[in-house]
């Protein structure tokens, strides 16, 4: 591993659409990939009238937008579906929203999902 880089080997997995997609609902996903590729964790969620609904969590493969991010933070301004990615084992257990376009001091909305259970 490159010095200073947090190697991602596994991520929290969740799929709200698990019945339609025919996957596990929750678990811990081992992250595989080509040797020359970096591995990340991600989370996607929706904000429905102030209520956080997680869509998916899991491994995300070699994406420059995720490099050296220890925290999973969405920075886009009011997306339809929120997305963040990070490096480090299980770094997607918590995620937050800090919109870059805000002029005023942004407020964090950290979300801690329920711990994973194996089906």
């Amino acid at each position: 591993a490159i010095l200073g880089r947090s190697e991602t080997q596994e991520c929290l997995f969740f799929n709200a659409n698990w019945e339609k997609d025919r996957t596990n609902q929750t678990g811990v996903e081992p992250c595989y990939g080509d040797k020359d590729k970096r591995r990340h964790c991600f989370a996607t969620w929706k904000n429905i009238s102030g209520s956080i609904e997680i869509v998916k969590q899991g491994c995300w493969l070699d994406d420059i937008n995720c490099y050296d991010r220890t925290d999973c933070v969405e920075k886009k301004d009011s997306p339809e579906v929120y997305f963040c990615c990070c490096e480090g084992n299980m770094c997607n257990e918590k995620f937050s929203y800090f919109p870059e376009m805000e002029v005023t001091q942004p407020t964090s909305n950290p979300v801690t999902p329920k711990p994973p259970y194996y089906n």
């Epitope: 339609k20 997609d21 996957t23 596990n24 081992p30 998916k56 997306p79 997305f83």
Partner: antibody
Amino acid sequence: EVQLLESGGGLVQPGGSLRLSCAASGFTFDSYGMHWVRQAPGKGLEWVSSINYNGGYTSYADSVKGRFTISRDNSKNTLYLQMNSLRAEDTAVYYCARAATWHDTHLDYWGQGTLVTVSS
Amino acid sequence: DIQMTQSPSSLSASVGDRVTITCRASQSIVSYLNWYQQKPGKAPKLVIYAATSRASGVPSRFSGSGSGTDFTLTISSLQPEDFATYYCQQSYENPLTFGGGTKVEIK
């Protein structure tokens, strides 16, 4: 080097059956989900079916549901597609492809394809 | 099902041209958008995944952009080996769906 090699295609009459195989090498087969994607002559790509790393979950396109069955034998590093009640519209090149993660972020490696022709 | 609409369906260009292909999803797919290149008689080859990431061995002249519903594949300087058909594909949910393809032909 990752390699996927399909076989089992051929000419079959409407209503007939065929079993396609996809032999995998160059990677840890039992760690990856796998897919079948088809392409009718002169047409675009159509997803057919997928199976997770251990065979516990399978999914199908509506057009093949109830007629096709995807399976895998991890001890043989082989993916299968059992096709029954074949129709003329199933005529296509069938590709197997590897899913990059559990939730299928992308299909990173593909086989060369095997042609299935359904005709009387 | 999520519909993927690609445009144009075909285009003619010369070596050295900048080429742009667009793909629109019928609903937000975040960054779950991939681009594949296919040459006649060959299997598709992954070019771009997660909207912006280049696959292994893909030249830097290929780039992807976009998120949500609108995405773009750009070839900055078209080379002879780039003449092919390009497909976008969403992997946000099953069934996985592809765009209709864009055939890049020699002018």
